[in-house]
């Protein structure tokens, strides 16, 4: 009785055991044995097939037959079969097992094929806890993670398998702990059109941190009340709070705070002055008598009731600029005029504090006295 079998195979290979005897033998049963343990029993001569060999299939194999009596009456030769490792158990390596939050990590699933079977193609898959990473199975033994966050902390492992799926091996689990950088240097910055905060216009309060990783919660506060004006949580080093239309009452001191789960850090207090555009000024004319006459000193007083100083006032007779006067601390300004016969007509003034100019209503003046006013002495039309 002879057992024919390969003596050396690789994981995943199929193994055929053939037990051969005299053809005229009458047998009641035949069996295959491994390491003295019965594997399988047949009523006639049959092959024994191991579909996909594993390392544990290594051992001493023989076959036996049984005649009419109950004893196994014939035993074959012993064939020692050695199942060789096709590729080593993979080892998971990482560019860093304690990466900084927000930074990249490169994972590698390292293994080695048997030198006799370098033609075998493998594929790889990476896992965190029980979750597949990336796009799943790939021919590349590397996985690039562009940015890791604190919630990515956990157990990582990888699997390697032949593309035929016959052999699959898994690495040991490795702990990756993502390091969070605390917040540093919080600053509050004002962004406003033209660089100055003006009533009615948009204001942006920009809260920035010099360093810090992960989700940062930014909050803005008014110092006087200490109440939060707004809160934003985002994965960035800055956040904006927009005030669409600033009111005069919004003037005051502000600060912001940033927190990424460590100690919250506060910015310095920033004072925000709100500049008020001038309101429409009122022009008041004062002359010695009820009726302006040649030689009178006419005082033109222009005042905008609202508006941040300094305010520049300009005085007009018709479209001619007579002069200007500044009110450095706000309030009104005056301009004096010695009246002549030609000073009849409409007077107006303009207030401007750099946030836009406003013109008063025109105030008519008629001069009494010699040669009374004849509008520039022109009687003819255009």
């Amino acid at each position: 009785l002879t057992l024919v079998a390969p003596s050396s195979v690789f994981e995943g290979d199929s193994i055929v055991l053939k037990c051969q005897g005299e053809q005229n033998w009458k047998i009641q049963k035949m069996a295959y044995h491994k390491d003295n343990k019965e594997l399988s029993v047949f009523k006639k001569f049959s092959d024994f097939l191991i579909q996909s060999a594993v390392l544990s299939d290594s051992g001493n194999y023989f076959c036996s037959t049984k005649g009419q009596l109950f004893l196994w009456d014939k035993t074959s030769n012993i064939v020692k079969i050695k199942v060789q490792e096709l590729f080593q158990r993979p080892v998971l390596t990482a560019s860093s097992f304690q990466p900084i939050e927000g930074g990249p990590v490169s994972l590698k699933c390292e293994t080695r094929l048997s030198p006799q079977r370098l033609d075998v193609q493998l594929q790889f898959c990476f896992f965190r806890e029980n979750q597949v990473l990336g796009s799943g199975w790939s021919s590349s033994p590397e996985l690039q993670i562009s940015a890791v966050w604190s919630e990515d902390t956990g157990s990582y492992w990888c699997k390697a398998e032949t593309v035929t799926h016959r052999i699959r091996k898994q690495s040991l689990q490795s702990q990756i702990h993502v390091q969070r950088i605390p917040i540093s240097n919080v600053s509050l910055e004002i962004r406003a059109p033209g660089g100055q905060v003006t009533e009615g216009q948009k204001l942006i309060l920009l809260c920035s941190v010099a360093g810090g990783t992960g989700n940062v919660t930014f909050s803005w506060y008014r110092e006087a009340t200490g109440t939060s004006m707004g809160k934003k949580t985002q994965r960035s080093l800055s956040a904006e709070l927009e005030i669409p239309a600033v009111k005069e009452s919004d003037a005051g001191k502000y600060y912001c705070r940033a927190d990424n789960g460590h100690v919250p850090i506060q910015s310095k207090v920033v004072n925000i002055p709100v500049r008020i555009p001038v309101s429409r000024p009122v022009l008041t004319l004062r002359s010695p008598g009820a009726q302006a006459a040649v030689g009178d000193l006419l005082e033109l007083h222009c005042e905008a009731l609202r508006g941040s100083p300094p305010i520049l006032y300009q005085f007009y007779h018709e479209d001619v600029t007579l002069g200007n006067s500044s009110a450095p601390s706000g309030g009104g300004a005056s301009f004096n005029l010695s009246l002549t016969a030609e000073h009849s007509g409409n007077y107006s003034c303009e207030a401007n504090n750099g946030l836009g100019a406003q013109c008063s209503e025109a105030v008519p003046v008629s001069i009494s006295g010699p040669d009374g006013y004849r509008r520039d002495l022109m009687t003819a039309g255009v």
Partner: antibody, heavy 116, light 108 residues
Framework: EVQLQQSGPELVKPGASMKISCEAS????????MNWVKQSRGKNLEWIGL????????TYNQKFKGKATLTVDQSSSTAYMELLSLTSEDSAVYFC?????????WGQGTLVTVSA | DIVMTQSQRFMSTSLGDRVSVTCKAS??????VAWYQQKPGQSPKALIY???YRYSGVPDRFTGSGSGTDFTLTISNVQSEDLAEYFC??????????FGGGTRLEIK
């Protein structure tokens, strides 16, 4: 009828001073601003300054401060312009002109020649 | 100071023609512009004030137009007595009045 009558032509030596007159008639002299204008040989017109005959207030073109002095005599309805420290650059025709912003009435002009 | 530029020093025209004299201000003078006519040996004569208003007694063949920085004096149907020098003047900032350099109108 409004009329502005200026004094006649003058030939003066460099360094000297002289006064031009402008006598107004046909209107109330003190009720209107009087201006003075220089016209050089190149025909360019330059505004020198103005005077309010009612109170004698003057305003000068920066260029002519220290060169021209404007005065009035209300009793004779006459405006005067004195030109100081004359040089050849001051040779020109000088006009008096009535008006607050633009000038509907002009004197006939006074030719001043500065020559050694 | 506001500079008034009359780019054409001389202009030639024929009697009966229409001619336009231009004046450009170095900044916005609204409509505070006057035009004067001056004949040799005479004093200037006011023609137009406030850019487009004709002064009393001025023939209606003289027309002023423009605002801001560009101004034009148009003489239609030019007569022999119109051959003279024409000056523009701005009076927008009291009292720094400035004149253009003048444009002499001549017969071709």
């Amino acid at each position: 009828e409004v009329q502005l009558q200026q004094s006649g032509p003058e030939l003066v030596k460099p360094g000297a001073s002289m006064k031009i007159s402008c006598e107004a008639s046909g209107y109330s002299f003190t009720a209107y601003i009087m201006n003075w204008v220089k016209q050089s040989r190149g025909k360019n017109l330059e505004w020198i300054g103005l005077i309010n005959p009612y109170n004698g207030e003057t305003t000068y073109n920066q260029k002519f401060k220290g060169k021209a002095t404007l005065t009035v005599d209300q009793s004779s309805s006459t405006a005067y312009m004195e030109l100081l420290s004359l040089t050849s650059e001051d040779s020109a025709v000088y006009f008096c002109a009535r008006g607050l912003y633009w000038f509907p009435y002009w004197g006939q002009g006074t030719l001043v020649t500065v020559s050694a | 100071d506001i500079v008034m530029t009359q780019s054409q020093r001389f202009m030639s025209t024929s009697l009966g023609d229409r001619v336009s004299v231009t004046c450009k201000a170095s900044q916005n003078v609204i409509t505070n512009v006057a035009w004067y006519q001056q004949k040799p040996g005479q004093s200037p004569k006011a023609l137009i004030y406030s850019a487009s208003y004709r002064y009393s007694g001025v023939p209606d063949r003289f027309t002023g137009s423009g605002s801001g920085t560009d101004f034009t004096l148009t003489i239609s149907n030019v007569q022999s007595e119109d051959l003279a020098e024409y000056f523009c003047q701005q009076y927008t900032n009291y009292p720094m009045w400035t004149f253009g350099g003048g444009t002499r109108l001549e017969i071709k």
